[in-house]
Interface confidence: medium
């Protein structure tokens, strides 16, 4: 920002500066460019020999300047325009100045003033420029001080020159008040704080409703002597509840908010939430939905999901794998675990009882993130209950459950678990095991065989021990094994079908199960 | 009253030289810029050449150049143009006009350089 | 050089009548136009100098306007002694230029 204490051009020839000597050298004229008036001091005495003409403006109050800049707009004619050479004629003029407290009026006395420079044009104007009418003008800047009285005059000295000063313009350079980063700059005097510190540090004031970081710096900008802002350090955010518009914080419209001092904006109070208020730092839940502790403020608030859709329970012998489908209801949340519990009842005394400790499941039963899961080590006559409860992040927040339950009655004994032992090119040993709980119920064991790809015959072997071995077979060849159980009650579960083969005659090969 | 009187036209054949003159009056010739115009029949205004107040600088059209040379004697008030190697084209109307020159001592010129005053004019003719 | 285009080249007119005629050029040249009437057989005579201004002893049906590169004249009331061609002429640089002319006739 440029603060202005004098501009010639400005005043329209009102500005009535004081030449000596009176009446001869400087004097005010208008002329039009541009189809504008504009006035000049001009002087043009370059046929009569040496020149001491002195223009001096009026007083000029220093206000708080310590530098100020000095702008001179001017005309300079080229001596070899004249008829005749004019022997006498210089190019350039010299410009001083003088500070006082007071005012001396017309009291002018050249030894007051020092001298600043000599200004020379970087142009002159030469005949067919000054015939054409195209007015070469020279713009030269100086500064000066730093000044320490009240105020100052300028004076301009003619040596001999044909000259026009169009415009004088003396100004001193401020810091302009600024808003950057949301703090507040005051205006600042351009000054050298020293000669190897030229930038003066200001500290900045955050604007309304504006804070600084936690854990960062504080505004500062660096002032420099041509009033120039450098380097911003630090900033301010707009504090929760306000966002940034422009320069300043704006309080978050009714149905918005910000939960945090920060650059962005405010946010759309998310689903299922209740409309806010003006400057909201958060938007509450709707009556029925919630936010989990680790939830952000925008996200939309959610609920607990509705119960597992179609819960069915296969039985497999001793063992009963649970399907089931996604809640038709997640409740608008994508973190749904499922738990299974189970219930044993006996069917003669109508007993019943958790049954976690005594059964075994495929995965841990709580925490499912499938939607399946196998239990196994059934016992036979009984019947079980199984629940599966559907829950998400929020479902901790209610104390109702969201569960659906299947039964099933254990009739069969597991099916028994079958390994090859060992085998050799005309035979295979066969082992297998039930669990404990369940052999007392076991009368004997039924294994059947045949060749693979022969389906017109098989072969059947009984067996009270876990293990059998199958002889007479043929070398290097795919036997199909199955082991079934026999109960009291008739046929337990069969086994799964195994592919066992005997070793070729040229021997070694790997045992394949 | 301000005058402008030209003289010197005539017929000449191409490749020949005329010298016209413009004798001034009623105003001071020594502070006028002067200038002259050409016309050829039934065409329009063509800038032939000017001269500053004192002699200097001189300026000419790019169809002249060189073949004209423009000059003045402001202790006779007469403005003259040597014409040479003189062409058909060339034929026409040759008008003297003069403006305010401004030529003062003044740091920045005041009056503008339009054609104020114009003689009567003169023809020239080349033919052979 | 700076060219000047001037439209129309002639023009029929009648007495009264408001006439316009315009003046381009071929880059800007502020207000450094003249223009000029000029009568068969006679010598032109300045009408409008620095675009606008009114020569001394012209009548003041007579006006110039414009600045850059158009320009106009205008007589707001076409008198008998107004017949004549008319030419304008900018002096931005040395080597000043005419327009060709516009011719006007009487209806």
């Known amino acids: 920002k440029e603060v202005v204490l004098l501009d010639f051009a400005a005043m329209k020839g009102e500005l009535g500066w004081l030449t000596h000597p009176y009446g001869k050298g400087w004097d005010l004229m208008q002329n039009i460019m541009d189809d504008m008036p504009i006035y000049m001091y001009s002087v043009c005495n370059v046929v009569s020999g040496d020149q001491d003409n002195w223009l001096r403006t009026n007083w000029v109050y220093r206000e708080e300047a310590e530098r100020i800049f000095i702008e001179l707009k001017f005309t300079v004619r080229d001596c070899n325009s004249f008829p005749g050479g004019a022997s006498s004629c210089k190019e350039t003029f010299n410009l001083y100045y003088a500070e006082s407290d007071v005012d001396y009026g017309t009291n002018f006395q050249k030894r007051q003033f020092t001298k600043i420079d000599t200004i020379a044009p970087d142009e002159i104007t030469v005949s067919s420029d000054f015939e054409a009418r195209n007015v070469k003008l020279n713009v030269e800047e100086r500064m000066v001080g730093p000044l320490t009285r009240k105020g100052f005059y300028l004076a301009f000295q003619d040596i001999g020159a044909c000259v026009a000063l169009l415009s004088v313009r003396v100004y001193y350079k401020k810091c302009p008040e600024m808003l950057q980063s949301l703090a507040r700059f005051p205006e600042t005097i351009a000054v050298a704080v020293s000669d190897t510190q030229p930038l003066a540090t200001v500290a900045g004031t955050c604007v309304d409703h504006a804070v600084v970081p936690y854990g960062g710096e504080g505004p500062l900008m660096h002032c420099t002597v041509d009033g120039e802002w450098l380097v911003p350090i630090g900033q301010c955010l707009c504090q929760e509840g306000y966002e940034k518009v422009e320069d300043a914080c704006r309080a978050c419209s009714p149905g918005f908010f910000k939960s945090e001092a920060s650059e962005s904006p405010c946010l759309e109070c998310p689903e299922h939430t209740l409309p806010s208020t003006e400057g909201a730092t958060s938007c509450q839940c709707e009556e029925g939905y919630f936010r989990a502790p680790e939830d952000p403020l925008s996200m939309s608030c959610t609920r607990p999901p509705s119960a597992p859709n179609y819960l069915t329970a296969i039985g497999m012998g001793a063992k009963v794998e649970l399907r089931w489908t996604a809640p038709k209801d997640t409740g608008g949340r994508q973190d749904i675990v499922y738990s299974v519990t189970c219930e044993q009842c006996w069917p003669e005394s109508g007993e019943c009882g958790p049954c976690e400790a005594s059964v075994r499941y495929s995965e841990p039963p709580h925490a499912l993130t499938r939607t399946s899961v196998t239990v196994s080590d059934l016992e036979p006559h009984m019947n079980y209950t199984f629940a599966v409860e559907a829950r998400n992040g929020v479902s901790g927040l209610v104390t109702s459950r969201s569960f659906r339950t299947a039964s099933v009655s254990i009739n069969q004994t597991e099916p028994p678990k079958v390994r090859l032992e060992d085998r050799s090119t005309t035979s295979l040993s066969v082992t297998w095991s039930i669990p404990v709980s369940q052999q007392s119920r076991v009368w004997k064991y039924e294994v059947t065989y045949r060749k693979k790809g022969d389906a017109n015959s098989y072969n059947v072997r009984r067996t009270e021990g876990f293990s059998v071995t199958l002889d007479d077979l043929a070398p290097d060849t795919t036997y199909l094994v199955q082991v079934q159980a026999l109960t009291q009650e008739g046929q337990g579960a069969g086994s799964k079908v195994h592919e066992f083969q005997t070793l070729s005659t040229e021997g070694s090969a790997n045992m394949a199960v | 009253e301000v005058q402008l009187l030209e003289s010197g036209g005539g017929l000449v054949q191409p490749g020949g030289s005329l010298r016209l003159s413009c004798a001034a009056s009623?105003?001071?010739?020594?502070?006028?810029?002067m200038a002259w115009v050409r016309q050829a029949p039934g065409k329009g205004l063509e800038w032939v050449s000017r001269?500053?107040?004192?002699?200097?600088?001189?300026h000419y059209a790019d169809s002249v150049k060189g073949r004209f040379t423009i000059s003045r004697d402001n202790s006779k008030n007469t403005l003259y143009l040597q014409m040479n190697s003189l062409r058909a084209e060339d034929t026409a109307v040759y008008y003297c006009?003069?403006?305010?020159?401004?030529?003062?001592?003044?740091?920045?010129?005041?009056?503008?350089?339009?054609?104020?005053?114009w003689g009567q004019g003169t023809l020239v003719t080349v033919s052979s | 050089d700076i060219q000047m285009t001037q439209s129309p080249s002639s023009l029929s007119a009648s007495v009264g009548d408001r006439v316009t005629i315009t003046c381009r050029a071929s880059?800007?040249?502020?207000?450094?136009l003249a223009w000029y009437q000029q009568k068969p057989g006679k010598a032109p005579k300045l009408l409008i100098y620095k675009a606008s201004n009114l020569h001394t002893g012209v009548p003041s049906r007579f006006s110039g306007s414009g600045s850059g590169t158009e320009f106009s004249l205008t007589i707001s009331g076409l008198q008998p002694d107004d017949f004549a061609t008319y030419y304008c002429?900018?002096?931005?640089?040395?080597?000043?230029?005419f327009g060709q002319g516009t011719k006007v006739e009487i209806k």
């Open positions: 009623g105003f001071t010739f020594s502070h006028y810029m």
């Open positions: 006009a003069g403006y305010d020159s401004g030529y003062d001592y003044v740091a920045v010129a005041g009056p503008a350089e339009y054609f104020q005053h």
């Open positions: 880059q800007s040249i502020s207000t450094w």
């Open positions: 002429q900018q002096y931005n640089v040395y080597s000043r230029t």
């Open positions: 001269i500053g107040p004192s002699g200097g600088p001189t």
